[in-house]
């Protein structure tokens, strides 16, 4: 009896479901009562699942396996393995007995994508050319072990003085830490690339060091190239799409949205069903559009903490993923202006003008200018403080010596929204009180 399995390993993402394909050619008049089907681990011979005496005997493998009962009669002896774990990796043998006997082994290769690497420097301040610096590149929760590559700004590989360690957690997923020791030149860019050899997925980050200053990063899945900008408190749509084939069925679809860096699950659609939000119940898919290839995610009541990269994983017959960035923004309020002192002002007095604008995001750019539009850059101190929601209050202080009269304007710019909020104060030359009395 000829039993057919794929030659290549079946690659499955941790936490998703995998199908170990196995088929045989039923003869005319074949009946399930004739079938003995056994799935077992090739090496240990541990029973995984079986079908005998015309009945599915069920899973012997942590209740995470299932056959395709409606397809058995057509010769489809495939095994569905749910919620794949690293420990599942290995060879599974499919034994089929009807009149004759046949078997074949299929390999399961488990994989998990690595997060975008984070980069740290030691020391990270007062750097000068000639200093030796240690750059650490860390990427998390991937499998199997990663390949790590370093290169400079010109793409030249850096192989000397690299130490890489990989540690598996309880789930068998690896955290990789790679350390590069370099002697700084006048300036330099250092890139770390963490490659998942199974997924052929590259995660990379780079750091540019300018000494004497603190360093300051198979299914075609389509997402917007530009970040999605969303106002705090509004709803955002993270667009993701794929091209369904004729006859595409939602039962074939595995869709996973997760945070790119931490791999935290955000939302999923598997086994023909919306599995719901795993992200504070603030996410939703567009169920009526999934069959047309629209895998977009709706994120409700956006918060500052939502900012970052979200990855859309789509698995049908093949697998594909793409990441979309969410840029959160909040407009700054119209600045309020205060003077200190604010009465009996005379030409020649030094006055402190404070410009305050509230509850914006991200951090603002603040500009001062006089009545003629000439920038005022000296004696300006600006502070920005985030509240519990991550929104910034900005306070900018200008110290000036009063002339005969003068107008002082403060402009608070939100760099993402390209929104300018401005306030101004006019101080006349004669003795005066601020605000002017009616």
């Amino acid at each position: 009896l000829e039993v057919q399995v794929p030659e290549d390993p079946v690659v499955a993402l941790v936490g998703t479901d995998a199908t170990l394909c196995c088929s045989f050619s039923p003869e005319p008049g074949f009946s399930l009562a004739q079938l003995n089907l056994i799935w077992q681990l090739t090496d240990t011979k541990q029973l995984v699942h079986s079908f005998a005496e015309g009945q599915d005997q069920g899973s012997a493998y942590a209740n995470r396996t299932a056959l395709f009962p409606d397809l058995l009669a057509q010769g489809n002896a495939s095994l569905r393995l749910q919620r794949v774990r690293v420990a599942d990796e290995g060879s599974f043998t499919c034994f089929v007995s009807i009149r004759d006997f046949g078997s074949a082994a299929v390999s399961l290769q488990v994989a998990a994508p690595y997060s975008k690497p984070s980069m740290t420097l030691e020391p990270n301040k007062d750097l000068r050319p000639g200093d030796t610096v240690t750059i650490t590149c860390s990427s998390y929760q991937g499998y199997p072990e990663a390949e790590v590559f370093w290169q400079d700004g010109q793409g030249v590989p850096l192989t000397g003085n690299v130490t890489t360690s990989q540690m598996a957690n309880e789930q068998g997923l690896f955290d990789v830490h790679s350390i590069l020791r370099v002697v700084l030149g006048a300036n330099g860019t250092y890139s770390c690339l963490v490659r998942n050899p199974v997924l052929q997925q590259d995660a990379h980050s780079s750091v540019t060091i300018t000494p004497q200053r603190s360093p300051t990063g198979a299914v075609e899945v389509q997402v917007p190239e530009d970040p999605v900008v969303a106002l705090v408190g509004t709803d955002a749509t993270l667009r993701c799409s794929f091209s369904p084939e004729p006859g595409f069925s939602l039962a074939q679809l595995n869709l996973i949205w997760q945070l790119t860096d931490t791999k935290q699950l955000v939302h999923s659609f598997t086994e023909g069903r919306d599995q719901g939000s795993a992200y504070a119940n603030r996410t939703a898919l567009f169920p009526d559009l999934l069959a047309q290839g629209n895998a977009s995610l709706r994120l409700q009541r956006v918060r500052v903490a939502d900012e970052g990269s979200f990855t859309c994983f789509v698995s049908i017959r093949d697998f594909g993923s793409a990441a979309v960035s969410l840029q959160v923004a909040a407009p700054y309020s119209k600045p309020s202006m205060t003077l200190e002192p604010n009465k009996d002002l005379r030409p020649g007095d030094t006055v402190t003008i404070t410009c305050s604008s509230y509850r914006g995001y991200p951090e603002a750019e603040v500009f001062w200018q006089d009545g003629q539009g000439v920038p005022l850059t000296g004696n300006v101190t600006t502070s920005q403080m985030a509240n519990e929601q991550g929104l910034f209050d900005v306070h900018s202080v200008l110290r000036v010596v009063l002339g005969a009269n003068g107008t002082y304007s403060c402009l608070v710019r939100n760099p993402v929204l390209q929104q300018d909020a401005h306030g101004s104060v006019t101080i006349t030359g004669q003795p005066m009180t601020f605000p002017p009395e009616a």
């Epitope: 409606d70 397809l71 091209s243 595409f248 939602l250």
Partner: antibody, heavy 119, light 109 residues
């Protein structure tokens, strides 16, 4: 052998709703395959209208999406094409056909039923 | 919506070879268009021949084959027989739906 048979009213008035039935014998519509509606206008032009797959997933021709729905009765082995409002331009011969998932051919066709929309 | 174009009519002799093509208004036809070929004989008898560019439906004679030729999908009838005298429609998949061509009348005489 698999057989598909289309049935419908034959003559309807404009703006009326309409339901056509495709009865499948010899195969379970929940086992596999995707089940299509296709129509042929006078003059021979064919138009693919949509399908319902074995698990109930629908896909429709965008030009018809808001006017039709495809549903099924699994216990009777039937699937249906429903129009919410017909026009004279819906006069055509309507066919159902089985599509093979992964190979994408239409391997079995119903014999078709002629629908005339006229006041 | 995309427009799919076929030759209106082709003629061949018994035993001859005829190639029908299917062009897309949106550009080159690729395997992602899952080209489909359907035969219609008198009395509206339809038979599916080819799906997914080149997958022959069960029971379809091997003289029918599907392929991509240049930027078009093609149906080749090699060793045509008189019973192949029929109308042939191609359909191309555009992400969520099929669009049929106008059909090619093949005469075998």
């Amino acid at each position: 052998d698999v057989q598909l048979q289309v049935s419908g009213p034959g003559l309807v008035k404009p703006s009326q709703s309409l339901s056509l039935t495709c009865s499948v014998a010899g195969y379970s519509i929940t086992s596999d395959y995707y089940w299509n509606w296709i129509r042929q206008f006078p003059g021979n032009k064919l138009e693919w209208m949509g399908y319902i797959s074995y698990d109930g997933t629908n896909n429709y021709n965008p030009s018809l999406k808001n006017r039709i729905s495809i549903t099924r009765d699994t216990s009777k082995g039937q699937f249906f094409l429903k129009f919410n409002s017909v026009t004279t331009e819906d006069t055509a011969t309507y066919y159902c056909a089985r599509g093979k998932d992964g190979s994408y051919y239409f391997d079995y066709w119903g014999q078709g039923t002629t629908l005339t929309v006229s006041s | 919506q995309a427009v799919v174009t076929q030759e209106s009519a082709l003629t061949t002799s018994p035993g001859g070879t005829v190639i029908l093509t299917c062009r897309s208004s949106t550009g080159a036809v690729t395997t992602s268009n899952y080209a489909n070929w359907v035969q219609e004989k008198p009395d509206h008898l339809f038979t599916g021949l080819i799906g997914g560019t080149s997958n022959r439906a069960p029971g379809v004679p091997v003289r029918f084959s599907g392929s991509l030729i240049g930027d078009k999908a093609a149906l080749t009838i090699t060793g045509a027989q008189t019973e192949d005298d029929a109308m042939y429609f191609c359909a191309l998949w555009y992400r969520t739906h099929y669009v049929f061509g106008g059909g090619t009348m093949v005469t075998v005489l």
